[in-house]
Amino acid sequence: LSVQQGPNLLQVRQGSQATLVCQVDQATAWERLRVKWTKDGAILCQPYITNGSLSLGVCGPQGRLSWQAPSHLTLQLDPVSLNHSGAYVCWAAVEIPELEEAEGNITRLFVDPDDPTQNRNRIASFPG
């Protein structure tokens, strides 16, 4: 099992759309594949794929998940908010017929505020 994730770096504007792709390849056929997307180490969703279909279509806030045979798992964030910024990792495991797992490399998502002054104020504001 191998997992290739892309892009490595994604910079989008707040309110637009971000697409993260995970390519999951296995040399032999599989009956059930467990997939997982994490953001900054926290699980966003953990559905499985069987009979060509995802068990879940949503993945985290404003996240939509899709599977395109033979190997493409797509996470679409729409609309993107500032809170979506972070490090995303795709993980996959063949559950049936036998356990094998792999994960992709990090996709770093940077979200630019619609109002550039928001970014300046956010960086400049310190607690206390």
Partner: antibody, heavy 120, light 113 residues
Framework: QVQLQESGPGLVKPSQTLSLTCTVS??????????WSWIRQHPGKGLEWIGY???????YYNPSLKSRVTISVDTSKNQFSLKLSSVTAADTAVYYC????????????WGQGTMVTVSS | DIVMTQSPLSLPVTPGEPASISCRSS????????????LNWYLQKPGQSPKLLIY???TRASGVPDRFSGSGSGTDFTLKISRVEAEDVGVYYC?????????FGDGTKLEIK
């Protein structure tokens, strides 16, 4: 361009262990997503898959040979090996090493094969 | 184990004529998850190692002449050569990659009449 070359003794005595090595050139054996396999062909017969090892070290063997087979990888030498224990005359065959990618479920590169005879 | 059955075992063909080889598997090689048939075809020319011709039942491998074509799905597959040439002689094998153990058909020996 990936090339595979089998090497090892052409004659093995019954009950001994057959040891073959496949040297990979033009490609790193530790590349993610690739499997390294052994396949044999008895004289005048068809092809029999022995097993393969993947980039993570996971091994998959033909159940008919599993108790006697070990496939391992030496990344420092860019080689992978086959050991088949307790051989008999029925193990006399041409042994091929081959490779495939997770992305594509087929053997796209093969070695030229090495003939191994089991005889006393 | 999945059993692969090829027919015919021997195939004498006149150059320029078409040829067809059948391969049947004891269970379906189609996966709805990947929308693929895990069936490959190889040609082993005399004294050589096998060479990939067709993968996923119908996709020609790089460098393979377009006179070779693969078709079928599930359990029934066919390799066709539209016009046989002298260089096509050898043994043709079908092979499944659906699960381990991987198994091959017994082979079809194509010879020139």
């Amino acid at each position: 361009q990936v090339q595979l070359q089998e090497s090892g003794p052409g004659l093995v005595k019954p009950s001994q262990t057959l040891s073959l090595t496949c040297t990979v050139s033009g490609f790193s054996i530790s590349t993610s997503g690739y499997y390294w396999s052994w396949i044999r062909q008895h004289p005048g017969k068809g092809l029999e898959w022995i097993g393969y090892i993947n980039y993570g070290g996971g091994t998959y063997y033909n159940p008919s040979l599993k108790s006697r087979v070990t496939i391992s990888v030496d990344t420092s030498k860019n080689q992978f090996s086959l050991k088949l224990s307790s051989v008999t005359a029925a193990d006399t065959a041409v042994y091929y090493c081959a490779t495939m990618a997770d992305r594509f479920a087929f053997f796209d590169v093969w070695g030229q094969g090495t003939m191994v005879t089991v005889s006393s | 184990d999945i059993v692969m059955t090829q027919s015919p075992l021997s195939l004498p063909v006149t150059p320029g004529e078409p040829a067809s080889i059948s391969c049947r598997s004891s269970q379906s090689l189609f996966s709805s998850n990947t929308n693929r048939n895990y069936l490959n075809w190889y040609l082993q020319k005399p004294g050589q190692s096998p060479k990939l011709l067709i993968y996923h039942a119908s996709t020609r491998a790089s460098g393979v002449p377009d006179r070779f074509s693969g078709s079928g799905s599930g359990t029934d597959f066919t390799l066709k050569i539209s016009r046989v040439e002298a260089e096509d002689v050898g043994v043709y094998y079908c092979q499944h990659h659906y699960e381990t153990p991987l198994t091959f058909g017994d082979g079809t020996k194509l010879e020139i009449k």
